[in-house]
Interface confidence: low
Amino acid sequence: NQDLPVIKCVLINHKNNDSSVGKSSSYPMVSESPEDLGCALRPQSSGTVYEAAAVEVDVSASITLQVLVDAPGNISCLWVFKHSSLNCQPHFDLQNRGVVSMVILKMTETQAGEYLLFIQSEATNYTILFTVSIRNTLLYTLRRPYFRKMENQDALVCISESVPEPIVEWVLCDSQGESCKEESPAVVKKEEKVLHELFGTDIRCCARNELGRECTRLFTIDLNQTPQTTLPQLFLKVGEPLWIRCKAVHVNHGFGLTWELENKALEEGNYFEMSTYSTNRTMIRILFAFVSSVARNDTGYYTCSSSKHPSQSALVTIVEKGFINATNSSEDYEIDQYEEFCFSVRFKAYPQIRCTWTFSRKSFPCEQKGLDNGYSISKFCNHKHQPGEYIFHAENDDAQFTKMFTLNIRRKPQVLAEASASQASCFSDGYPLPSWTWKKCSDKSPNCTEEITEGVWNRKANRKVFGQWVSSSTLNMSEAIKGFLVKCCAYNSLGTSCETILLNSPGPFPFIQDN
């Protein structure tokens, strides 16, 4: 077995947005560090068979299976997949190793299975077996994190019951509003499950795994902030834990905080207090209200009071199942060609939604922003002034929501014409929808002013695939106009556009654009 070549099998995972993934299967571009698949000799097999470690791939992922052969001389090869042979072009790398690659773009169920690579070198023949399967993400879950108090310590534990086990991180911010965006320098991230520093302005816990990232914010009432004009509202589902933090800063320690639910003090064991001195020697107190598993009767106004600050309240609403509240009536918009415009949907939802905007079968990422009144808003501005139907789709664990928008772009008509032996037709997609006139050009009317009214059939506006409107007008040919030039004109409030057609005997028809 001494003349057996040294073989290395590797898997290269390409990032989804990676434009460097080659179209050909011979020279893919490496975009990630290769993963060694082992390639061990398979015992008790007829012939020399190497077996690579099984490869699990996400749906739509792009990968390269690659074999590096350290053998003298030239090699030839053949890939076989599901009894079909696939082209194979080996090349040599800088270390003079033979390199054979198979690129799988956007993995689907049909591309899963056994890939056999037959290699013939000057010394010997051998087979390499790759088994590629689609990762069963049906078993995967990513649950929103929740908080628990750490036993006998003033600290919170962040828990996300997810598969595969997620990476948990705390996202902390000590400034107000916009500057607490994820990328802001004011934001500090701690990749740990337990948090002791609970005095910050904004505290979130995030969990991430292969399915994405989910975050939960520690709901906070800050008695030093002017209250919002609408009461902050917190939704929870029956059985979920409730955590509300009340925070207050005062010049000295001579103040206390209390929690009340509908004017009754919270039961002992449902709150705990912490306090610290800040850098300028003022006292910060925080008082947590918590319920380990909420029931319907935990609904109500939770009021945090201080002997030195005005009290503030939050409305906690316990629901049986999640919801998405928004108006789903479709909306039509009419804008100018260069007018700035965004679609927007205002909604209230719990748990937080996942959403997409879709136009012309293409999906666009969807961003949501929380408003002060408990609502959220998602805007879509990237329409590039393309008229048609836009769809907003949102869902959470318990609810789905779809809303349709139609965008019309005001513009002067553009006319296209076509003709057959028996009729001439003109089409236009201007907006507002154009009206049509047909005119005959003759010696009597060289400027084509003689209007044709007979045999004209205007088709009611016809919606194109993605909601764009098109109008057409057809002129049935009569003896009176055969051999003449006719002009069809489409006009709307923004202008007129015409096309001139020569109605000669059957054959090619010249069109003269006439604006």
């Epitope: 209250p227 106004y301 009021t303 009071s305 409305l315």
Partner: nanobody
């Protein structure tokens, strides 16, 4: 649904006094805290005083001594007694229960 209606505002000379009333409809009045706020032209709304359901009172420190908050649960009304008024007390005064706000009453202190 709670509805709040402030009254008692008006024009008063510096050093004068006014008593504002906040009448509430709805059964939650006696169970809840009442806050008075004010908003001067071009400024943010600021907290003035608070009375708890048990009758405990809290004041913006700079106003303590001049302003007194009280309540009459039988009449579903809260009051703000303002003495030794100054031009800088000129504002629209609002009362609040939970997230319910009144429409406001204008107080103008001017000679």
């Amino acid at each position: 649904q709670v509805q709040l209606q402030e009254s008692g505002g008006g024009l008063v000379q510096p050093g004068g006094s006014l008593t504002l009333s906040c009448a509430a409809s709805g059964s939650t009045f006696s169970r809840n805290y009442i806050d008075w706020y004010r908003q001067a032209p071009g400024k943010q709304r600021e907290w003035v005083a608070q009375i708890t359901s048990g009758g405990n009172t809290h004041y913006e420190p700079s106003l303590k001594g001049r302003f007194t908050i009280s309540r009459d649960n039988a009449k579903n009304t809260a009051y703000l007694q303002m003495n030794s008024l100054k031009p800088e007390d000129t504002a629209v005064y609002y009362c609040r229960i939970l997230d319910y706000w009144g429409q406001g009453t204008q107080v103008t202190v001017s000679s």
